[in-house]
């Protein structure tokens, strides 16, 4: 039909941008690259029905429908949710296409169902459908991809038994150490589940889906390499397939390589040995060692031995259950205003552990990086010298770890007095927490030397009232004291400062302010 | 979220008082201070004094002494300023705004404007 | 009490432009500087508190820094949506007091 617009329905998911520390929190919205729900005409349909791809949200996701119509002249519209109007306001783009958008912000339940856009132009009526819906998150699971050997070839399968399917790379490093970060230039991937090329120096197998990524490193041996000053360990759960690279390089093919748990050799069909010439025509081999499903008898040393190498070995501990061994004892910590400090948290864990840094109720992300002991580590840099209380948690499929920090930093104490009908009340934010002293001004001490001593109460930490490490005094009105100045002043090893205040009962009570250094 | 809803405007004549409300909400009241903040009209911001909603206890700027009277009420969560002999340079409009720190205002009410005119 | 003084004024810049807006304090106040940005018509909005500290929901592009009775709050690429009013205000001690604000307007 000549007369029927071109139409164009897209959905722009909205992901939640938050980077900084601070005192409160607001969410600026950031828009994702729209994805086409392309819009079809529905058959057998009174009118001029068009039906976009159905739509699955999170929970508390933003989104916008949008429609892009391609028509001549003027457009009106108006939106329909569960027998509800809602107001429409198209608007023109560059390319002078009519553009209406419906914003879902924070998506829950109730804003699930059909939304109905009735457009009108001047050449004619229709119907543009669209159905939300919530996404079914609870079915969802990503699983560590493992390995198995291909039957027949020489080549590995990675599997993740996940939902949604995932998708599955290979992530591949031919170079040492810190080159051979994901983002390295060194770093190959390559998107598919099984692998021949099996002689590189590091290899991992990645599993992505909705729910993230997950990773599992190839254990390798490398007998070319001095090794580790501890020994490497490997765990692994009981039932798990257990599977360990041993790699040699020698000038000539003349050399041979076996794997021994315990100095006994492994049973035929728990190896397979590969073989190929480098680009220098040296002779690469390599060795693997795998068990299908490990028990707790599988646990102990495995040696890989050459005849033209060094042998190296490995702890593999099978466990029963996955673990976090860690300290979780807390940690206070005083830094100065500018002083560089990081939170760090040392850990030994199986599975690997998926972790968040807590401060003020925000979250933000956690980079864990191995050591060469076996332990890794986890450290926090973001606090941009901000006070109170962080939190590290940990968990993997059978643990959870907390661990709970507080940074104090140092800084002279400022005062804030105010006083009402019986008292008067100093607080201050200083750090190391400050010591008070309060002073009556008079004829005979127009300085402010004569010390009061009685009716004051301090109160130390009291993080009400700023919402922050606050110490606070408070003098009680006596006779003695009433309509005189009197001076409180919080000191630390940093500084002074000091407030005064008119003690004048009833009315307002006027202050000076002064600071000492 | 936090939300610091102030009363309407208000226009008074020389002498007058006039009492301005603020309502708080979205986080524990008595935790943190309000201070009042005036803005005449094309200028800058002026502190007034603050009250300490736990205590009820006040600290005013020496300008206003004797002029502003700062109270609350803990049951609705509400602060009030009233400033006395008003004058035609207290036209201006009026903020409370809450204490994240000892002296920072890190949320602040949509103002009240007060115009004093005979 | 302690005089906060801005300069410039005003000043007229582009979108994607660096700004620095600088704050002269009467007397050492250490770190206590907060920066405020008001629109027309709008309460003031806490951008950067202790000088340097960003506040939540205040894009990075905002930045303060400076100590003693120096000040400074760059902008490191101007939007659209930062033609406003900038204050400096010391919360070293009491009363509070504000910079005359410098205005930002769109070159």
């Known amino acids: 039909n000549q007369d029927l617009p071109v139409i164009k329905c897209v959905l722009i998911n909205h992901k939640n941008n938050d980077s900084s520390v601070g005192k409160s929190s607001s969410y600026p919205m950031v828009s994702e690259s729209p994805e086409d729900l392309g819009c079809a005409l529905r058959p057998q349909s009174s009118g001029t029905v068009y039906e976009a791809a159905a739509v699955e949200v999170d929970v508390s996701a933003s989104i916008t429908l949008q429609v892009l119509v391609d028509a001549p002249g003027n457009i009106s519209c108006l939106w329909v949710f569960k027998h509800s109007s809602l107001n429409c306001q198209p608007h023109f783009d560059l390319q002078n296409r009519g553009v209406v958008s419906m914003v879902i912000l924070k998506m829950t339940e109730t804003q699930a169902g059909e939304y109905l856009l009735f457009i009108q132009s001047e050449a004619t009526n229709y119907t543009i459908l669209f159905t939300v819906s919530i996404r079914n998150t609870l079915l969802y699971t990503l699983r560590r991809p493992y390995f198995r050997k291909m039957e027949n070839q020489d080549a590995l399968v990675c599997i993740s038994e996940s939902v949604p399917e995932p998708i599955v790379e290979w992530v591949l490093c031919d170079s040492q150490g810190e080159s051979c970060k994901e983002e390295s230039p060194a770093v190959v991937k390559k998107e598919e589940k099984v692998l021949h090329e099996l002689f590189g120096t590091d290899i991992r197998c990645c599993a992505r889906n909705e729910l993230g990524r997950e990773c599992t490193r190839l254990f390798t041996i490398d007998l070319n390499q001095t090794p580790q000053t501890t020994l490497p360990q490997l765990f692994l759960k009981v039932g798990e397939p257990l599977w360990i690279r041993c790699k040699a390089v020698h000038v000539n093919h003349g050399f041979g390589l076996t794997w021994e748990l315990e100095n006994k050799a492994l049973e035929e069909g728990n190896y397979f040995e590969m073989s190929t010439y480098s680009t220098n025509r040296t002779m690469i081999r390599i060795l693997f060692a795998f068990v299908s499903s490990v028990a707790r008898n599988d646990t102990g040393y495995y040696t890989c031995s050459s005849s033209k190498h060094p042998s190296q070995s490995a702890l593999v501990t099978i466990v029963e259950k996955g673990f976090i061994n860690a300290t979780n004892s807390s940690e206070d910590y005083e830094i100065d205003q500018y002083e560089e400090f990081c939170f760090s948290v040392r850990f030994k864990a199986y599975p690997q552990i998926r972790c968040t840094w807590t401060f003020s109720r925000k979250s933000f992300p956690c980079e864990q990086k191995g050591l060469d002991n076996g332990y890794s580590i986890s450290k926090f840099c973001n606090h941009k010298h901000q006070p109170g209380e962080y939190i590290f948690h940990a968990e993997n499929d059978d643990a959870q770890f907390t661990k709970m920090f507080t940074l104090n930093i140092r800084r002279k104490p400022q005062v804030l007095a105010e006083a009402s009908a019986s008292q008067a009340s100093c607080f201050s934010d200083g750090y190391p927490l400050p010591s008070w002293t309060w002073k009556k001004c008079s004829d005979k001490s127009p300085n402010c030397t004569e010390e009061i001593t009685e009716g004051v109460w301090n109160r130390k930490a009291n993080r009400k009232v700023f919402g922050q490490w606050v110490s606070s005094s408070t003098l009680n009105m006596s006779e003695a004291i009433k309509g005189f100045l009197v001076k409180c002043c919080a000191y630390n090893s940093l500084g002074t400062s000091c407030e005064t205040i008119l003690l004048n009962s009833p009315g307002p009570f006027p202050f000076i302010q002064d600071n000492i250094s | 979220q936090v939300q610091l809803v102030q009363s309407g405007a208000e226009v008074k004549k020389p002498g007058a008082s006039v009492k301005v409300s603020c309502k708080a909400s979205?986080?524990?009241?008595?935790?943190?201070?309000i201070s009042w903040v005036r803005q005449a009209p094309g200028q800058g911001l002026e502190w007034m004094g603050w009250?300490?909603?736990?205590?009820?206890?006040?600290n005013y700027a020496q300008k206003f002494q004797g002029r502003v009277t700062m109270t609350r009420d803990t049951s609705t969560s509400t602060v009030y300023m009233e400033l006395s002999s008003l004058r035609s340079e207290d036209t201006a409009v009026y903020y409370c705004?809450?204490?994240?720190?000892?002296?920072?205002?890190?949320?602040w009410g949509q103002g009240t404007l007060v115009t004093v005119s005979s | 009490d302690i005089q906060m003084t801005q300069s410039p004024s005003s000043l007229s810049a582009s979108v994607g432009d660096r700004v620095t807006i600088t704050c002269r304090a009467s007397?050492?106040?250490?770190?206590?500087v907060n920066w405020y940005q008001q629109k027309p018509g709008k309460a003031p909005k806490l951008l950067i508190y202790?000088?340097?500290s960003l506040q939540s929901g205040v894009p990075s592009r905002f930045s303060g820094s400076g100590s003693g009775t120096d000040f400074t709050l760059t902008i490191s690429s101007l939007q659209p949506e930062d033609f406003a009013t900038y204050y400096c205000?010391?919360?070293?001690?009491?009363?509070?007091?504000f910079g005359q604000g410098t205005k930002l307007e769109i070159k």
């Open positions: 705004a809450r204490q994240g720190g000892l002296r920072d205002f890190d949320y």
């Open positions: 979205g986080y524990t009241f008595t935790s943190y201070g």
């Open positions: 009250i300490n909603p736990n205590s009820g206890g006040t």
């Open positions: 007397q050492s106040i250490s770190t206590y």
């Open positions: 202790d000088t340097s």
């Open positions: 205000q010391q919360s070293f001690i009491t009363p509070p007091t």
